[in-house]
Every structure is written in C-alpha cells, then in structure tokens.
C-alpha cells in the first residue's frame, strides 16, 4: 500500500489555445486529469488500473502552480493504491478548459481539451522527487512525481506491513525496509522479550520488563546470584539455598545463639571488663568510678557513703570531700578529737575513756551501732528470712513472718521435717515425734544453730604501742586503751598535729 | 517506626505493690544497645528517671528507688514490667516508660499512664 | 546526684523573637552528656537535642544547643507559634539520670 505523488509546477498556454487550435474565451480556465495505470509500452485509452484523480482549476493560460499540501493536500496530487508497487507505470495527464463550474467529463465539450501527455517508465519507491517537463506544440508542463508508501507500509514495494507498537504483543518501531527494531531494553523476534538487569543470573533470576532482575525462590541480591540461607537463619550462610552454616562465635539451628556477646557486640564502656555469661548474655566488671549494666553512667562518689561518723560527703569535679562534724578530721572523718567530755555517743550509748581521756569508746544500746551509736541498725538489710518470709523490724530485735508450710525463727523449717535443712551454719537436723532437733558443729548454737559464739576479736593484737586491747563481746569488736602520747583507733598515731594522710 | 505503651492500674491502694508493663510494637525488645527504661512524672512537676533494663535482663536503678522497685523483661511477649512495692501518695504520677538507644538519650515514649495512689 | 537547675522558669516572648533557655547542673557534666526535651500538655516529652549540640532528625534548624562542664543553652532562634511549650534539659553522664525542672516557654 503506497501513494503515488504528483506536483504540478508550472503550465505554459502562452497563446490562450486549445488543442484543436481554437482560443478560449476569455482565457483558458485551466484545470487537470491525471490517469495512472498498469505499465504500458504504448500508452493507450482505458481503465485508470492505478486510479485517478482531478484537480479543480488551477489558473488561466500560462501559470505555476502552488504546493498546497498543507491546505487541503490538493497539490500534490495524490493517487493511493492498496497493492504492491510493481516498479513501473503508466501516466496519462491531460490539461483541460472549464467554460463553467461543472468539471464533470459529461458536462464539458469534446474540444475543450488543451494538452495531453503520455509517459511510461520504472519508478522506486523512494523519498526523492523525479522532475519532468512535457513540450508540445503550444503548451508546456513542468511537474515532478514519486512514490511513497502509506504508513506502517514498508520496503521496496510498500509490500512490508510494520506497526510499531509497545504493548504486551511486541515494543518495536519499523525500520526503513520494515524489518523490526526493537525498543532499548527488548529483544526477540517480536521484541517480547526483556533484556534483563546486566548480570542477572541466568538460571537463578529473571525479568518481566527491561533493566529487572527478579529471583527465583531460593535465590536474593541485586543479580539474583545470592542464595537466602534458612528462614530466621541470624548469622549464618549458605552456598545453596534454605541452607544456615554459623558464622564463628554462633551456634544454634538458626545460628541465632550468640556464644561471643562481648566480642560481636562490646557492649561495656568506659574500659569495663566484658564476660560472656551465656547465650546472648553478658557481664560488665566496671573500673572504679562507673556503674549501670554496660558502665555506661558515672557514679557518684559519695554513693558509696565514704564519709564516717556523721560527716556529709560533697561531689566534687575531681572526686569528693568530707565535712566532718565538730570533733573528727581526716579524709573520711575517722578521726576523733573528742573525749567522753565532749557527750559523743548518741541514742543512750555509755561512753569509756580511753587512753587517759584522750580518746573513747561508745558502748550502744541494742539497735543502734556506729563508732557513736548513730546508726540505727536495721536487722532486716541482710533478708535473714528464708522462704520468702517477711522481715519485721521490732525495737531491739528483728522477727520473720512465714508463708504458709514454713516455721523456726528465720522461716528456715518446712514444717514439721529436715527436708530444707533447717540448722544453719552447717548443723545436723534430727527428725523427732515433736519437731526436730539440730546439732550445731563448734562455734555456733541456738535452737537452730543460728547463734555464733563469740569469737576474741583481740586474739590478732590489733592494738599498736602497747596499747590494751578489750574485746566488745556484743559485737564481736575490740577496742584499744591508748597508753599516754598515743591516739587513733588502733592507738596507731602519735599525740600532735592531726596526721596527715597519705591517701 | 517502633512504638512503645504502658498498661497497668490507674489506682492503687497505699501500701500495695504497683505493677506496669510496658508493650513494645513494630520494633524487637531483642535490639542489644537499647536500655528500656522507666521515667515518671509527679502532677505539675519534673520528670525523674525510675530505672532501665536491657534485653538480657541486666538492670540499674535510681538510688532513690532501689530498695523499692524491680524491672523485669519477657522478650517472648516484647514487654518490660515495673513492680513499686510499699507505695504511698507520694508515688502518684504519671509513668512513661521510653527507649534509649545506646545512651540515656530517650528517643521513644509511650504515651504515658497516670497511676494514683490512694485508698 | 547531680542537680540540674533551668532557668527562667518561666519565660515571656513573642513570636518571631529568640527564646534562650539556661541550664545548669550541680557538677561538671562529662562528655557534654547533655539532652532537651520538648513536652506539649497531656503528651510525652520530646527528644529535641543530645550530646548537648546535636540536632534529632526532624527537628526544625531553629533549635539549637550550646555549652559545656555545667553551662547549657537551648536557644529557638525565631519563635514560631507551636514552639511555646515546656522544654527539659537533662543530663545522662552519671548515675542517677537527672531532669531539670524545666522552663515554661509562653506567649506575650
């Protein structure tokens, strides 16, 4: 399927004449038929096989002929045909006067014709106009023609149907000889088949439009060229799929058991010590000066309530300080300048002179303890209860309030057997009728063996210079009678300035 | 984007035990590096940090609130709990509970849950 | 315990004007471990600012943090209208982790 394309150019009639020689009145009104038809060697009368066309008129006498294909396409004339080009023609044009408007052939006179030419020849399809000029004896036409084929219509003869397209059937344009040229990304006879992401493996990936590359199961990564190990694999690989080989310092069915927390993880600061404690546990040993899980926070030095006998502790940028109270010095206010004199024993605590009166001793009252009886004890910050039992503070002493099933003073007896061994510190527990009974090894007693025996606590000579040492048998403490010119706990400083220390 | 929400009694009685927990959704309570912590914030005032947990069960508590409370954590439910026994008037607040994510820079809260304490 | 004081308590502006908000702390804060926060009434606070400079993703440039040892600032360079709130600083070098009391930020 094509179009054969003639362009009227110029016609000359200078002599205003017809063909039989008689002149047009005013002046030829000029107008034209074109037939085309099958090749011929002698051109000759009959059906216009290849079609025909007219134009209306075009001017009078001598005159050129404008293109007009962009109002209305009248000029060139156009001559489409739905058949293969066969590369020869025939063309019959024929210049004709209108006396009125009617151009029918029918309506018009046998004489009114002008001119008549006749040509025949090979012609390729092809872009490029063919120029030609006919001469007769009072007339010349110059015009020039060619054959072009009709769109989506390709090839030598316009015998080629090619319409690009860019849907799931193919995504292709047409080529000069209307063979197909696919769209950038597709490939295949029809242009049907994506060209996938560069790379993408061959057997392991595929694609559904260009530049993809999608996996087949089993398979991940941008080219497909990774295997996915087993669901909820953690930290481990594979080489095929559904695989899960543990990376090092990993255990587990899904490698998800971490036997190295501090390694993979350091999760300790500020210098900590880390211990694996255990599948995906850990613990930090924190420097001096740090607390929290990891060592992560700062402690506060005075968290650890340095200061003694009374004295308030004070942050510090570089640490902490003592204000001690009136009657002690050094760096934890563990220094006393006061004497029995002075009422230094709180809570009804007796003072005793030492070292001829200059130093003391606080003997307290059962619940309270300190070097002046100024702490209060709270018998239950050791939880002496077992099994659960409530501790109950009561005046001097402390008393535990069993669960349901449990007896004996600190909640340690299952009721009325041996079964959670019931004697402390060690005792044989005997089963009798009415309860039982413990026998306690050496150093403790009580019904439950939960009562040590004093021990001498100046059996080490914790005193220094000849000091006389005195054992505190309520608290299992000594205390040291200073010889004159000599103070300090352990009569350890000679009497003067307060000692400066070296810590 | 990790979301986290308190759940819990809004009224105890003096002297009992308060119990929260707090749920964590769209995100794993497993992440190492988190602390997940506990904050509350008496009516019209400040805000005092309570204490952290972390995955592996290791905690560090306020001073202040130590010998009263415990952090618990169930990493198969994605929760932390908190448990403030002998609590008085004083304990009244509202609780968050929130994440850090590696320091005690609290990037996520929940929404907060007002507990009275009153009999 | 390291006490954080914030100071003004209360502070009066217009929008459109600079907000400066001062807080102090007790001790030396290390490594400018040093945090704000946003609160609006009846929500959870908001991380604004940590390591005493550094600015969350999603928080407008008009926020910013300055200082050092006890000496913090948060400053709101122009004031916008959902920006008069109550703001936190705390502070999360040492243990216990402290909070301010905090500064009301109201509209003139």
């Known amino acids: 399927s094509g179009v054969f394309q003639l362009q009227l150019q110029e016609f000359i009639n200078e002599r205003g004449v017809l063909a039989s020689g008689r002149p047009c009145e005013p002046g030829c009104r000029t107008f034209f038929r074109v037939c085309l038809k099958h090749f011929q060697a002698v051109v000759s009368p009959g059906p216009c096989t290849f079609g025909t066309v007219s134009t209306p008129v075009l001017g009078t006498n001598s005159f050129a002929v404008r293109d007009d294909s962009s109002g209305g396409g009248r000029n060139p004339l156009q001559l489409p045909f739905n058949f293969t080009w066969p590369g020869t023609f025939s063309l019959i044009i024929e210049a004709w006067h209108a006396p009125g408007d009617d151009l029918r052939p029918e309506a018009l006179p046998p004489d009114a014709l002008i001119s008549k030419i006749a040509i025949q020849g090979s012609l390729a399809v092809g872009q490029n106009w063919l120029l030609d000029e006919q001469t007769s004896t009072l007339t010349r036409l110059r015009y020039s023609y060619r054959v072009i084929c009709s769109d989506n219509y390709y090839g030598d003869n316009c015998s080629r149907l090619c319409k690009k397209r860019n849907d799931h059937f193919g995504h292709y344009v047409c080529q000069p000889d209307g063979n197909l040229s696919c769209l950038p990304g597709w490939t295949g006879e029809y242009c049907q088949q994506p060209i996938c992401l560069s790379g993408c493996h061959e057997q392991n990936g595929y694609c559904s439009k260009p530049a993809e590359c999608l996996c087949r199961p089993g398979w991940q990564g941008r080219l497909c060229n990774e295997c996915i190990p087993h669901n909820g694999c953690r930290h481990g690989t594979c080489s095929t799929p559904w695989q899960c080989t543990c990376d090092e310092g990993w255990g587990g069915l899904f490698c998800d058991q971490d036997l190295n927390y501090c390694t993979h993880h350091s999760p300790c600061k500020n210098g900590a010590t880390c211990s694996n404690s255990g599948q995906r546990s850990y613990t930090c040993t924190c420097r001096p000066g740090y607390t929290g899980v990891d060592c992560e926070l700062e402690l506060s030095e005075c968290d650890s309530n340095p200061c003694r006998n009374g004295g308030s502790c004070k942050d510090q940028e570089d640490g902490y300080h003592c204000l001690c109270p009136p009657g002690y010095y050094g760096l934890h206010c563990e220094h006393s300048t006061l004497s029995c004199a002075d009422s230094p024993c709180f809570n009804g605590g007796s003072c005793r002179e030492r070292n001829q009166g200059a130093n003391y001793a606080c003997e307290c009252p059962p619940n309270f303890t300190g070097s002046n009886c100024e702490k209060k004890v709270d018998r239950c910050t050791s939880n002496p209860c077992a099994n659960g039992g409530q501790c109950l503070n009561r005046g001097p002493s402390r008393m535990c309030r069993c669960r349901p099933g449990f007896t004996g003073t600190y909640c340690e007896l299952h009721v009325s057997d041996c079964a959670r061994n019931p004697c402390a510190h060690g005792g044989t527990c005997h089963d009798l009728e009415n309860g039982l009974m413990c026998t306690c090894p050496a150093g403790f007693s009580g019904r439950r063996c939960e009562v040590r025996t004093s021990i001498d606590a100046c059996a080490s000579s914790p005193c220094f210079n000849r000091a006389t040492c005195y054992t505190d048998l309520s608290t299992d403490t000594f205390v040291c009678n200073c010889p004159y010119g000599f103070v300090g706990s352990r009569c350890e400083f000679p009497v003067g300035l307060p000692p400066s220390f070296p810590w | 984007q990790i979301t986290l929400k308190e759940s819990g009694p809004g009224l105890v009685k003096p002297s009992q035990t308060l119990s929260l927990t707090c749920t964590v959704s769209?995100?794993?309570?497993?992440?190492?590096?988190?602390?997940w912590s506990w904050i509350r914030q008496h009516p019209g005032k400040g805000l005092e940090w309570i204490g952290y947990?972390?995955?592996?069960?290791?905690?560090h508590y306020n001073p202040s609130l130590k010998s009263r409370i415990t952090i618990s954590v169930d990493t198969s439910k994605n929760h932390f709990s908190l448990k403030m026994t002998s609590v008085t008037a004083a304990d009244t607040a509202v609780y968050f509970c929130?994440?850090?994510?590696?320091?005690?820079?609290?990037?996520?809260w929940g929404q907060g849950t007002m507990v009275t304490v009153s009999s | 315990d390291i006490v954080m004081t914030q100071s003004p308590g209360t502070l009066s502006l217009s929008p459109g004007e600079r907000a400066t908000l001062s807080c102090r702390a007790s001790q030396s804060v290390s490594n400018n471990y040093l945090a704000w926060y946003q609160q609006k009434p009846g929500q959870a606070p908001r991380l604004l600012i940590y390591g005493t400079s550094n600015r969350v993703s999603g928080i407008p440039d008009r926020f910013s943090g300055s200082g050092s040892g006890t000496d913090f600032t948060l400053t709101i360079s122009r004031l916008e209208p959902e920006d008069f709130e109550l703001y936190y600083c705390?502070?999360?070098?040492?243990?216990?982790?402290?909070f301010g009391q905090g500064t009301r930020l109201e509209i003139k």
């Open positions: 929130a994440r850090a994510p590696g320091s005690h820079t609290f990037d996520i």
């Open positions: 769209d995100g794993s309570i497993n992440s190492g590096g988190s602390y």
């Open positions: 947990i972390k995955y592996s069960g290791g905690v």
């Open positions: 705390q502070q999360y070098s040492r243990s216990p982790i402290t």
